[in-house]
Interface confidence: low
């Protein structure tokens, strides 16, 4: 007889890919716009990534560090109008990209929680949440949480009234902490948050340093659903140097849990290679002309545009692993195995009963290094086979598809491998 | 209501140059980009090119890239277009127009101000 | 530079029957073409602006379709105040060009 199926866990839908954070809608659509109204025309881009929900704003009116000239029931004309804002998230829904709001307060201000005025700003959160709950939102995102003073209980509060409305929203919290501490003591409370964190952003050293940081997570919050990101807004580029950028795609989307990009993640988009431009927000590359402020500062190859035309750039390989991400089973939800696969390397293997098995190996370091597979650290359940397909390597030339022997598996620097192979009974 | 109201008629004589404005009223004037277009009876509608103007930024028609000039003036909702060097080819209506994003078409034209090149 | 053809320089209709004004890119355009209406001695007004998105406030007598390189503008029971200019734009790439219009006329 054959084996009994293992019964799928309940998935919600940031379950099942991707977050795109659109912080600046002006930096992100350039050229002059910056509303809603033009956000609703980048839809479809959004969907060509795969993204399952769009983290957006503030939109809200905030006069800088002013509380009381501070609503977060209303959308800064700058931004748009109401009916804007039900446009977008309508044509949102019809392309089943859900759409999460931030609402931190005083974004434009010192202190994003106005310090001295915690229970006036934490009653306009809880009418904002209500509000909008009503008006379609799928979730909300609140940022700089350390610098809200009993944050813990004020989440756990928002956590009820979200979930209160619908099982299916989701409130996800920003920290600058990079402490695992700090971290814990925040989820401790909050069963379902999302949290996103400084945690990873100093793991570009070794392949040793990532492994364990991310096993030491992954072992602490226990069976709890998780997100992975380098920080709670910034760009991939502020943390990381680009030839760790997509081996760093790879991890984030082949790791249990919720990857979290920001917009320009997906094609490196570096505020460092445009000189005058805000580092936290700089203005999204779509084609050449999108930053004209120093002729031929900008190459084909920065863009969206560019990328799009070219299967071996950072946007096709992040197309690849989004669509790869949410429709195979064992990336979905699958168990999480690392194992030792030699100094610089992190490996581990991703599995779902009966499902194809994915084997992930990342060289961090900028050698070539030969794997030496560690099979005996893995489960009976996990097992590796001799061989494995090649699904895609974050590096050109290699022929996808062909089948690799684990034993004789080498790496060129700074290389990621997603390797298939099938359940074996 | 959305306004793009343009500066009136200009006649002036070859050689010299001209500036012409357009101000906009009834929204948020960085929020859209302005387009500048020129008709003339020989060629239809020509694009001479686009400006930011929330960053400032300008995209030519090669065509018009030492002919044209445009520029905002961020402060009066206001932007402008100059013409260099005229000649009697360059008599035409131009016309301002805005658009919300880069991917889409303009939506708004003003009234059109009238160059006529003529010694 | 994509070269925006309207073959038709005129078209002569009656009140309340339907025409088609067609536009034919020299490469493929995907569907960013715009559709403009001008009147003597005013600025065009925009119908479309993005195949098939009409413009706020256009009445649903002006359909458009197309995608690549072929664009129609169909107006169907036609009024006297449609009797204009129409022109076509394409918007997909630097420079945005224009087709030379056809201009809609009573029989």
């Known amino acids: 007889r054959a084996p009994r199926c293992r019964e799928l866990p309940a998935q919600k839908w940031w379950h099942t890919g991707a977050l795109y954070r659109i912080g600046d809608l002006q930096a992100f659509q350039g050229h002059g716009a910056g509303n809603l109204a033009g956000l609703k025309g980048r839809l479809d881009y959004l969907s060509s990534l795969k993204v399952k929900g769009l983290v957006l704003g503030p939109i809200h009116k905030n006069q800088k560090d002013d509380v009381a000239q501070t609503d977060l029931l209303q959308i800064d004309p700058n931004f748009g109008s109401k009916e804007d804002f039900d446009s977008l998230l309508q044509s949102a829904k019809k392309k089943s990209i859900r759409v999460i709001l931030d609402l931190t307060p005083n974004y434009r201000g010192e202190n994003s929680w106005f310090s001295t005025q915690v229970d006036t700003v934490a009653t306009k959160v809880k009418d904002a949440l209500e509000f909008w709950l009503q008006a379609g939102v799928d979730g909300f995102q609140v940022r700089d949480i350390e610098n809200l003073k009993d944050a813990s209980s004020f989440l756990a509060e928002w956590q009820n009234i979200t979930k209160g409305f619908s099982e299916d929203r989701l409130l996800i919290a920003g920290t600058n902490s990079s402490d695992l501490q700090q971290i814990l003591s925040l989820l401790e409370s909050n069963k379902d948050l999302l949290l996103t964190s400084s945690y990873l952003s100093d793991s570009g050293s070794t392949g040793e340093h990532t492994k364990s940081l991310v096993t030491q997570y992954l072992n602490a919050t226990g069976n709890r659903w998780c997100s992975w990101s380098l920080s709670q807004a910034r760009l991939l580029t502020s943390f990381l140097p680009a030839q760790l950028l997509r081996l760093y795609q790879l991890m984030l989307f082949t790791l249990p849990g919720t990857p979290v990009f920001s917009y320009g993640d997906e094609i490196g988009l570096d505020a460092a290679a445009l000189p005058g431009q805000p580092m936290e927000a700089p203005v999204m590359l779509w084609d050449e002309s999108s930053f004209p402020d120093i002729p031929g500062a900008v190459s084909a190859n920065m863009t969206v545009k560019g990328q799009s035309e070219d299967p071996g750039s950072l946007l096709s390989l992040f197309r690849r692993l989004s669509d790869q991400r949410s429709k195979e089973r064992s990336l979905l939800h699958g168990d999480f195995h690392a194992f030792s696969a030699g100094p610089g390397l992190f490996s581990y293997i991703r599995h779902w009963d009966q499902n194809e098995r994915f084997l992930v190996v990342l060289n961090f370091g900028d050698v070539g290094l030969s794997a030496g597979l560690q099979a005996s650290d893995l489960p009976a359940s996990a097992s590796l086979p001799a061989k494995a397909d090649l699904l895609l390597s974050t590096q050109p030339g290699r022929e996808e598809g062909s089948p690799l022997e684990l034993e004789r598996l080498k790496l060129e620097p700074h290389e990621g491998l997603l390797l298939r192979f099938p359940y074996a009974a | 209501q959305v306004q793009l109201q343009q500066s009136g008629a200009e006649l002036v004589r070859p050689g010299v140059s001209v500036k012409i404005s357009c101000k906009a009223s009834g929204y948020t004037f960085t929020d859209y980009a302005m387009h500048w277009v020129k008709q003339s009876h020989a060629k239809s509608l020509e694009w001479i090119g686009v400006i930011s103007t929330y960053y400032g930024d300008t995209t030519y028609n090669q065509k018009f890239k030492d002919k044209a000039t445009m520029t905002v003036d961020k402060s009066s909702s206001t932007a402008y277009l100059e013409l260099a060097r005229l000649t009697s080819e360059d008599s035409a209506i131009y016309y301002c127009?805005?658009?919300?994003?880069?991917?889409?078409?303009?939506?708004?034209w003003g009234q059109g101000t009238s160059v006529t090149v003529s010694s | 530079d994509i070269v925006m053809t309207q073959s038709q320089r005129f078209m002569s209709t009656s009140v309340g029957d339907g025409v088609r004004i067609t536009c034919k890119a020299s490469?493929?355009?995907?569907?960013?073409v715009a559709w403009y209406q001008q009147k003597p001695g005013q600025s065009p007004k925009a119908l479309i602006n993005l195949a098939p998105n009409r413009h706020t406030g256009v009445p649903d007598r002006f359909t458009a379709r197309g995608s690549g390189t072929d664009f129609t503008l169909t107006i169907s029971n036609v009024q006297s105040e449609d009797l204009a200019d129409y022109f076509c734009l394409q918007h997909w790439n630097y420079p945005l060009t224009f087709g030379a219009g056809t201009k809609l006329e009573l029989k």
């Open positions: 127009a805005r658009v919300w994003l880069l991917s889409y078409a303009m939506d708004n």
């Open positions: 490469q493929n355009v995907r569907t960013a």
